[in-house]
């Protein structure tokens, strides 16, 4: 485990949480649940009690917001960044964030409360069998009244358990209708209508008549939402599917992933996709928000990231339905505020004690690791020392392994990348990398494991670079790129993410290229790179000799030290000056003898 | 007691530059951000940026993006807002305003009048 | 960028209830929290509710504020001469923030 700098912590055990919104991914009391239930995860090992509030005066308040939400640290879009907390302390600190962008579900797809059928208002289970076929939403297969239900249990056909989903032709929402369904056909502005409408509306909301003429009557309600049935990207983002729809001639009652390779659920938003070709994707499992936060509240009440990836703090997401806290959780947390105190002895009960389940995380399915948030962004010292911005080093005792003499940096024939970060230079190997400060007689330190300090980060490495105002550091594997802000990581992210096309198969090294600019380089082609908005300009693509003459053509790193570009071939460099406006190399040599001043044995 | 205190009242000519300090006391400068809001007379509040004064990050209104420059100097618990190239119509008071899920202080505000 | 549209006027004689309402033009505020400020002449602005509904602490609990699909409302119950001011209601919108125009409450 990891805690901030001068272990930042509450010094009251009384601690008060506000939530100060919400998302429209969950109902409101899956959502409080969620967050209780994650705090008690915390309470249950620590003296700490967590009480709710409705004021912004609580230690901890918690948010959902999209991209720029107020902080300073913008969230990304959907995944990548998840969610962000501060460590603790007045203000800011303590607050937690959650990206609405994601899709927030308990970690086994969208929630979907039921109104009546026999369940007792239980959510959806998805998928569900019924009549020996698999649904992935609501659905009106077997009714003839058009009413959408689903099975609360994982098979209808052996369990008989159902309810029926949020649906207009069952209820409508606030308006001035006090709740009745929807009457299609309605008639407004003369026009007949048989389905929900944003029609005379700015907002985007859907509404529809309860009566057979709305401009007559004037009594209107909002259709409910159907996370279910929503979809995400293709062509009709934020519509519904519309079930049964036809597909290469044949009809669908539920999201298929036939015709496509990647196994993703998608559906048609018409009743015909061969006419009207109209689509999204289906909603998938989405993020646990009760995982999710519990993390988040670990760094709100003090802890940094784990190096244990079985940890609740490691910075990867992974769905789990064991017992969230690991050992190293617990060590971290009592760290801070010692163990829950034993209860009281008390007469003995009559009801026998449930056998409570082995500490340990089992995942249920393959641990896929998702990206994780860029949480815990911000001053590692205590708040007195005013900002420090997030921690650019990392863990300050960074795990040397025991040395043997593949680990001295000299023996390293080729490095996978080498980057100035801050104003040392940093050399990747193999998992490992060296630090070296230039000097008379000095020797690269280490080596240190990249695992301890960047745990994200796969063990080859292509190229890394510092973005010196923001302090960004980006690494480049194959297709993917990880960004750290201090120890807090966003990714993997796909090249293509940052606007590279699909032939670009690696980041062979970067280039400062004025303000909050970068060359990005690849093989032979080079393009210019705005860090800001993390985008190459397509424009920009140039061959790296027309810019930098004299350069091998075959380079595997380029770097830049000293306000000098690098080129790395083999075991060698050609260093390239710039003077009025012209690229010249000065100097070609050893990285080795001539940069790491290692001795010529 | 939680105060924000500007600095005085500037005249500029157009095309001139004006900053304008802001001073916090009374809570812990680095945990909250500093929004600034301006009123031109007899109309109504306009944002014009942001700054944490947490981390430095600034977030400007669309309009006044390479006009305005905001900064903190945690060192004296400071924010500058500076605003360039002055036209007549920037003439307005000058509001910081601490921010935190709503700006619950202001400062008193600085008159900032533009003329030849 | 969003607009938020108030009605630039209100009022009311002393005691009554006077409601001023805050829209969203081109994006949705039902979705996004409000703050509402008061601004009573020659001084800065207050914080007078901030996130829909919630009152710092010495705001008389005849304010109140609401916020369901696309409008947002600022409440003033049982109204009195010192209510006379300027009223902004203030939200997120992508990335910045959005002040209505402003509802000039006089008290009759």
């Known amino acids: 485990f990891q805690t901030f700098e001068g272990d930042l912590k509450w010094h009251h055990h009384n601690i008060t949480y506000w939530i100060q919104n919400y998302s429209e991914d969950l109902p409101r009391a899956v959502i409080d649940d969620a967050f209780a239930r994650a705090f008690a995860l915390w309470s249950a090992v620590t003296p700490l009690t967590f009480t709710r509030v409705y004021s912004r005066d609580a230690d901890i308040v918690i948010q959902f917001g999209v991209a720029e939400h107020g902080d300073g640290y913008p969230f990304d879009g959907k995944d990548g960044l998840l969610a962000h907390a501060f460590p603790p302390g007045p203000g800011i600190q303590g607050d937690a964030h959650f990206d609405d962008d994601e899709l927030w579900s308990l970690g086994k797809g969208v929630v979907v409360p039921t109104r009546f059928g026999n369940a007792d208002g239980a959510a959806c289970h998805f998928p569900f069998i019924f009549e020996g076929r698999s649904y992935s939403a609501c659905t009106t297969d077997g009714r003839s009244d058009g009413l959408p239900w689903c099975s609360t249990t994982a098979n209808y056909d052996t369990d008989d358990r159902f309810g029926f989903c949020p649906s207009e032709r069952l209820y409508t929402q606030d308006g001035n209708a006090d709740g009745k369904p929807c009457q299609f056909p309605f008639i407004f502005q003369g026009q007949s209508y048989s389905a929900c409408t944003t029609d005379g509306r700015s907002d985007g909301y859907r509404w529809c008549a309860t009566t057979a003429n709305y401009d007559r009557d004037k009594l209107f309600g909002f259709c409910p939402t159907r996370a279910d049935s929503t979809v995400m990207g293709g062509n009709s983002a934020g519509e519904l599917c519309v079930f049964p729809f036809t597909f290469l001639g044949k009809e669908y009652s539920t999201c298929t992933s036939e015709g496509r390779g990647d196994g993703r659920l998608w559906c048609a938003t018409t009743s015909n996709f061969d006419s009207d070709k109209k689509w999204g994707f289906c909603p998938d499992q989405g993020y646990s928000l009760f995982l999710v936060a519990a993390h988040e509240f670990g760094h709100a009440l003090g802890l940094d990231h784990s190096s244990v990836p079985e940890a609740l703090m490691y910075p990867m997401y992974r769905f789990t339905e064991g017992p969230p806290l690991h050992k190293d959780d617990v060590n971290g947390i009592r760290h801070l505020y010692g163990p829950r105190p034993e209860p009281e002895p008390r007469p003995p009960t009559t009801t026998t004690p449930q056998p409570t389940a082995p500490p340990t995380v089992c995942p249920t399915g393959p641990p896929t690791v998702h990206p994780s948030e860029r949480p815990t962004a911000g001053p590692t010292g205590p708040p007195s020392a005013g900002p420090t911005g997030p921690p650019t080093a990392g863990p300050s005792t960074a795990t040397t392994v025991p040395l043997s003499p593949v680990d001295d940096a000299c023996n390293v024939n080729i490095f996978d990348a080498i980057a100035e970060i801050g104003n040392q230079l940093y050399l990747f190997k193999d998992g490992k990398y060296w630090r070296f400060s230039e000097g008379r007689g000095s020797r690269p330190q280490g080596p240190f494991l990249i695992a301890d300090k960047w745990p994200a980060l796969p063990r080859k490495l292509d190229s890394v670079f510092e973005e010196r105002l923001s302090k960004k550091l980006f690494f480049f594997s194959g297709r993917q790129v990880w960004v750290y802000t201090g120890a807090s990581v966003l990714g993997p992210r796909r090249l293509d993410k940052l606007g590279l096309g699909a032939d670009v198969a690696q980041v062979t090294g970067a280039l400062r290229s004025g303000r909050g600019k970068m060359l990005l380089f690849s093989g032979r082609r080079l393009w210019r790179f705005d860090v800001k908005a993390q985008m190459v300009d397509p424009r920009s693509a140039s061959e790296v000799d027309r810019m930098f003459p004299g350069v091998p053509l075959d380079t595997h790193d380029v770097f830049q030290y000293r306000e000098k570009a690098y080129f790395c071939q083999d075991r060698f460099y050609w260093r390239v000056s710039s003077r009025s406006e012209l690229n010249q190399v000065d100097q070609v040599g050893y990285v080795t003898y001539d940069i790491l001043q290692c001795p010529e044995d | 007691e939680v105060q924000l205190v500007q600095s005085g009242a500037e005249v500029k000519k157009p095309g001139a530059s004006v900053k304008v300090s802001c001073k916090a006391s009374g809570y812990t400068f680095t945990s909250y951000g500093i929004s600034w809001v301006r009123q031109a007379p007899g109309q109504g509040l306009e944002w014009m940026g942001w700054?944490?004064?947490?981390?430095?990050?600034?977030n400007y209104a669309q309009k006044l993006q390479g006009r305005v420059t905001m900064t903190t100097d945690t060192s004296t618990s400071t924010a500058y807002m500076e605003l360039r190239s002055l036209r007549s119509d920037d003439t307005a008071v000058y509001y910081c305003?601490?921010?935190?899920?709503?700006?619950?202080?202001w400062g008193q505000g600085t008159t900032v009048t533009v003329s030849s | 960028q969003a607009v938020l549209t108030q009605p630039p006027s209100a009022s009311g004689t002393p005691g009554q209830r006077v409601t001023i309402s805050c829209s969203g033009s081109?994006?949705?505020?039902?979705?996004?929290?409000v703050n509402w400020y008061q601004q009573l002449p020659g001084t800065a602005p207050k914080l007078l509710i901030y996130?829909?509904?919630h009152r710092p602490s010495g705001v008389p609990d005849r304010f109140s504020g609401s916020n369901s699909w696309n409008t947002a409302s600022l409440a003033i119950s049982g109204l009195q001469s010192e209510d006379e001011a300027d009223y902004y209601c203030q939200a997120w919108d992508s990335s910045a923030v959005v002040f209505g125009g402003g509802t000039k409450v006089t008290v009759l």
């Open positions: 081109t994006f949705n505020i039902g979705s996004n929290t």
């Open positions: 305003a601490r921010d935190y899920y709503g700006m619950d202080v």
């Open positions: 996130s829909d509904s």
């Open positions: 700054i944490s004064a947490y981390n430095g990050n600034t």
